[in-house]
């Protein structure tokens, strides 16, 4: 059909991955489909299977090398085409010119540590996973509070517009549990997006002393 | 959105060659998946080739594979169809589409504007 529901989308961790989901309306569920990948400037080929995530989407990882390997560069071009099995051989169903500076979402932050908590306040520090040296300190977070009787959609957004890898939460409620969520995104890229949210991180800020407000 | 002009159709007998232009307006053609459809008259308009945006990449209908070539000239925002072994089957209008701007190419087209159309005639 013209205008189909077909959708080929990618992103690269800046570093040796390129993740990729491939839809399509009307498709067998047990349909054998790969991506491959096809760079303009490097001697390497790889190819990821794609496994089902959903009725119509299938997902796949194309490793390119060691997690922290700097496998592409803003210059590179990776050529990245969907085959499916059909009989005995495979068609090529879509395929993709892919900037990889231009598509980056990076992991999500790792290693989400208190490193103080009082009654009103509590600072979290974390790290980033896999992220390019390229960026040097042009990265930005969103944080969010999950709050008792609330969900993490209600929770307000909390923006860190630099490369800054703590937090100091205000005004919190003594003797409450809490838990915290951050992500991270380059400033580089035009179709660049937001990595997963971090694992939450579980504290409890202290309760307040009796007889003062502390 | 890009305005797509084709030019190039024709009278041609069996056996023979045609290579069809379809000239973009528009400063995303450089990053645009183009395609060419046709459509006979009483069928469905169906998919005949897509190039990546680069150029680097290539789909064809399994009835056109080896016969036609799509290719692009992104300084001069054009694409081209070089129609090779002509059939009275290839008889048709012949389409110029253009894709979501950085998107990929599709079999099942995804497209964002259309060209008016060229007419390809094989006569045996």
């Known amino acids: 059909a013209v205008n189909g529901t077909s959708q080929f989308t990618c992103f690269y961790n800046s570093r040796a991955n390129i993740s990729c989901v491939w839809s399509q309306d009307g498709a067998l569920q047990d349909t054998s489909c790969q991506v491959h990948a096809w760079p303009d400037r490097r001697r390497w080929n790889q190819t990821c299977e794609l496994l089902p995530v959903s009725q119509a989407s299938w997902a796949c990882n194309l490793i390119l090398g060691a997690p922290d390997s700097q496998k592409l560069t803003t210059v590179d071009i990776v050529t990245l085409r969907v085959l499916c099995r059909e009989g005995v051989r495979w068609r090529v169903m879509a395929i993709q010119d892919f900037k990889p500076f231009e598509n980056l979402r990076l992991m999500a932050p790792i290693s989400l540590q208190v490193v103080h908590v009082e009654t009103h306040r509590c600072n979290i520090s974390w790290e980033i996973s896999q992220a390019s040296h390229y960026f040097e300190r042009h990265l930005e977070f969103e944080a969010r509070t999950l709050s008792p009787g609330h969900t993490w959609e209600e929770a307000p957004l909390l923006t860190l517009k630099q490369k800054q890898e703590w937090i100091c939460l205000e005004t919190l409620t003594p003797d409450t549990q809490y838990e915290f969520q951050v992500r991270v995104k380059p400033l580089q890229g035009e179709f660049t997006t937001w990595s997963p949210w971090s694992q939450p991180l579980a504290f409890r800020t202290k309760p307040a002393a009796l007889g003062k407000d502390t | 959105e890009v305005q797509l002009v084709e030019s190039g159709g024709g009278l041609v007998q069996a056996g023979g060659s045609l290579r069809l232009s379809c000239a973009a307006s528009?400063?995303?053609?450089?990053?645009?998946?183009m395609y060419w459809f046709r459509q006979a008259p009483g069928k469905e308009r169906e998919f005949v080739a897509a190039?990546?945006?680069?150029?680097?990449?290539?789909l064809y209908a399994d009835s056109v594979e080896g016969r036609f070539t799509i290719s692009r000239d992104n300084a001069k925002n054009t694409v081209y169809l070089q129609m090779n072994s002509l059939r009275p089957d290839d008889t048709a209008a012949y389409y110029c589409?253009?894709?979501?701007?950085?998107?990929?190419?599709?079999?099942?087209?995804?497209?964002?504007?259309w060209g008016q159309g060229t007419q390809v005639t094989v006569s045996s």
């Open positions: 190039i990546t945006w680069s150029g680097r990449g290539t």
């Open positions: 528009g400063s995303t053609f450089s990053r645009q998946p």
């Open positions: 589409a253009a894709g979501p701007y950085g998107d990929a190419a599709y079999r099942h087209g995804r497209i964002d504007s």
